[in-house]
Amino acid sequence: AVDLTLLANLRLTDPQRFFLTCVSGEAGAGRGSDAWGPPLLLEKDDRIVRTPPGPPLRLARNGSHQVTLRGFSKPSDLVGVFSCVGGAGARRTRVIYVHNSPGAHLLPDKVTHTVNKGDTAVLSARVHKEKQTDVIWKSNGSYFYTLDWHEAQDGRFLLQLPNVQPPSSGIYSATYLEASPLGSAFFRLIVRGCGAGRWGPGCTKECPGCLHGGVCHDHDGECVCPPGFTGTRCEQACREGRFGQSCQEQCPGISGCRGLTFCLPDPYGCSCGSGWRGSQCQEACAPGHFGADCRLQCQCQNGGTCDRFSGCVCPSGWHGVHCEKSDRIPQILNMASELEFNLETMPRINCAAAGNPFPVRGSIELRKPDGTVLLSTKAIVEPEKTTAEFEVPRLVLADSGFWECRVSTSGGQDSRRFKVNVKVPPVPLAAPRLLTKQSRQLVVSPLVSFSGDGPISTVRLHYRPQDSTMDWSTIVVDPSENVTLMNLRPKTGYSVRVQLSRPGEGGEGAWGPPTLMTTDCPEPLLQPWLEGWHVEGTDRLRVSWSLPLVPGPLVGDGFLLRLWDGTRGQERRENVSSPQARTALLTGLTPGTHYQLDVQLYHCTLLGPASPPAHVLLPPSGPPAPRHLHAQALSDSEIQLTWKHPEALPGPISKYVVEVQVAGGAGDPLWIDVDRPEETSTIIRGLNASTRYLFRMRASIQGLGDWSNTVEESTLGNGLQAEGPVQESRAAEEGLDQ
């Protein structure tokens, strides 16, 4: 069963001091990661017992394995059902506590009733404040039965439930007619899925014979031990004030477990701690009684004395529950109540015995759950005991269950049952996850879900280059931390697999499925520098750069140009996808802006060092384009251009710029300044005869403006080859006079 305890502090003078604590003794409980177990949950269950709304309750986590609920403001907040959920996966378990109001009309004689399938359960509600009306019994909040108030027997109303079955389990309550449901007596009925002493799917298996009020779990045959007892059969008492499956927890406060109710996984239910009884667990056991709720009687023999926490304390020479066994009778010594081995291992199990006559090797045997008897392979004889060693054949899952060590001598016999848990080594169900990669390292999350049993003690990461036959490299990592695989080859695929281990010999599981993880390219190392830049317009910038000369091939796929506009806090990135490029035209920039410019080489997704930055000021935006540009050939070497001034000028034009290009030519265009801004005509001279030219122009104020439309015109025929175009400008009217 899951090691989960719900404690209720029943010192009820002040509801604000009331608290519920859920404690888990499970490994890794409450850590909250899906792979290693969900957190503990503690809440009030309002589905059956509804209380008036109040301020929300406060939940406080104390480490990973304890959670406490506080913040109760009035007594009615306490009434009802509380539950704690803990454990992971198939072991997820709900522990339930039912709280009754001490001032209720009716009070339960006993809150938790655990019965076997087919038994008769009797719930008894004691009259605390009489009311001469019917009594309504409810099951899980719905009407179940009714009694006339005259039917009370000895001041109690009884509900008899014959031949109970597991579906009868639940919360029962007894309430007077016309009385608040918060004044009900609340009960919890737990019906085991099997008859007395049986467990398993068809109830075919025999329970181990739980001692000290332990209850046999109908699913796994384990004893759920009362608080204060431990061992496979609950045969061992904890020290006073301790609880938990291994007595590992301690009751809070100076008065130990006084005033605390303990609720454990079904089919146990709730009780006071060992040595205490009463509705508020504040009364010590009467002489001769011990254990949880003081339900057990000592009946010590041979001078034994009764301890209310542990039962009979035997004088020298005697042992047994009632000190009924003489130390001359052989006795199994210090046998662990539970052993854990991994599947397919061949463990050695030791069993020690003492007695008079002294046990020898042949008098000690080991019996498996299937009835197979193993004889010891060797024995170590010491003055006070004989220890027999058994070599167990390769374990299979069916070996899980109760084993028994038995010693027989002429003085009598003794046997001790112990639980063997055969655990399946964990196997990852998924491949590890790649978190980040670099050229020579991969960062991997090894945390994966797994089949088989935890806890995970170690995680091994195996890796090697893809399609390689070389040995796997292995790294052992902490299960909860990411791992960095280092000193890898760049741009290489690696096969990566996880292997999980649980504690103990043979705890290594099979390797999980592989996954392919590829390292990044090598980082580019060369640092370019900016050769220069040229403003080609208010929003255009031509940039050129160089790289240092190094031997070998260039490591890079291209260049990244970055322009930082500090005023607006904006970055512009331009990708040049050829590693051979050394120049780029940046367009669509913001006129009149101060940019910081740099360039860096990239390879795959990695960037090399950036060039030292340059600072570039783009001129402000220029005027609109000149209108109605027209070209007219005057001779075999002259063409006249006419235009109209741009509209809506932001200021006086300083000059015009004419662009001349041979149509279909591959060469760079020629720019000619017209320095008299009042002109609306100019003659371009020195052109080649019978040649088709393209013209466009723009005005300049503080910066160059937009281009006009492009016009075409051909010079007249067969003149001599000119040296190159020049211009002469006049007022338009003069040009026409010529």
């Epitope: 009694l147 005259h150 449901p181």
Partner: antibody
Framework: EVQLLESGGGLVQPGGSLRLSCAAS????????MSWVRQAPGKGLEWVSG????????TYADSVKGRFTISRDNSKNTLYLQMNSLRAEDTAVYYC????????????????????WGQGTLVTVSS | DIQMTQSPSSLSASVGDGVTITCRAS??????LNWYQQKPGKAPKVLIY???SLQSGVPSRFSGSGSGTDFTLTISSLQPEDFATYYC?????????FGQGTKVEIK
């Protein structure tokens, strides 16, 4: 579907006895209170007797106290009314009835109406 | 025992009329009053419980009110199937007692 079927009615002389039965089906008979209600020809309804699920608690109208006995057999899902020292004024249709409880929004339970009735059986007391 | 007095003992009305029947208890019964409808040769059928709560499946033209000793059953608009005898009953204490009945006839 809840069904209540009365039987055992008939003609009986004054001072005589009769035992009425009511066979219940369609609900868990052993969990509910049951009652007998009668109606004299052309007259109103009169509650006669009631019994709790265990059979331990019984109540009677003053007019029948000491003469009539209500009982039940939960294993047979049957309600009985043993009528002794019958009088002419006991002539009536006898209904087997199941009263209910109801609860309010706060969860308080109250004794409610008779929500299921049989079809009735006629008892005639006459010489 | 608690006496229940119903009035009127009979009334004539037409389809569509509104009808009110009253019931008085000889002592306070809080709201533990139920109303039944009975047609000739049939068993009674519960209409209203707890003085004003409409039983499931009963048309909303039926309504109840009152508390303590005085209670009322109202049929807001009589339908042909509503012509029957109506009884009040207290479930406050045993013996449970019924009113003598009110017969609603067609005018």
């Amino acid at each position: 579907e809840v069904q209540l079927l009365e039987s055992g009615g008939g003609l009986v002389q004054p001072g005589g006895s009769l035992r009425l039965s009511c066979a219940a089906s369609g609900f868990t008979f052993s969990k509910y209170r049951m009652s007998w209600v009668r109606q004299a020809p052309g007259k109103g309804l009169e509650w006669v007797s009631g019994i709790y699920p265990s059979g331990g608690g019984t109540t009677y109208a003053d007019s029948v106290k000491g003469r009539f006995t209500i009982s039940r057999d939960n294993s047979k899902n049957t309600l009985y009314l043993q009528m002794n020292s019958l009088r002419a004024e006991d002539t009536a249709v006898y209904y087997c009835a199941r009263p209910t409880y109801y609860y309010d929004s706060s969860g308080y339970y109250y004794s409610g109406p008779i929500d299921y009735w049989g079809q009735g059986t006629l008892v005639t007391v006459s010489s | 025992d608690i006496q229940m007095t119903q009035s009127p003992s009979s009334l004539s009305a037409s389809v569509g009329d509104g009808v009110t029947i009253t019931c008085r208890a000889s002592q306070s019964i809080n709201n533990h009053l139920n109303w039944y409808q009975q047609k000739p040769g049939k068993a009674p059928k519960v209409l209203i419980y707890a003085a004003s709560s409409l039983q499931s499946g009963v048309p909303s033209r039926f309504s109840g009110s009152g508390s303590g000793t005085d209670f009322t059953l109202t049929i807001s608009s009589l339908q042909p199937e509503d012509f029957a005898t109506y009884y009040c009953q207290q479930s406050y204490s045993t013996p449970w007692t019924f009113g003598q009945g009110t017969k609603v006839e067609i005018k």
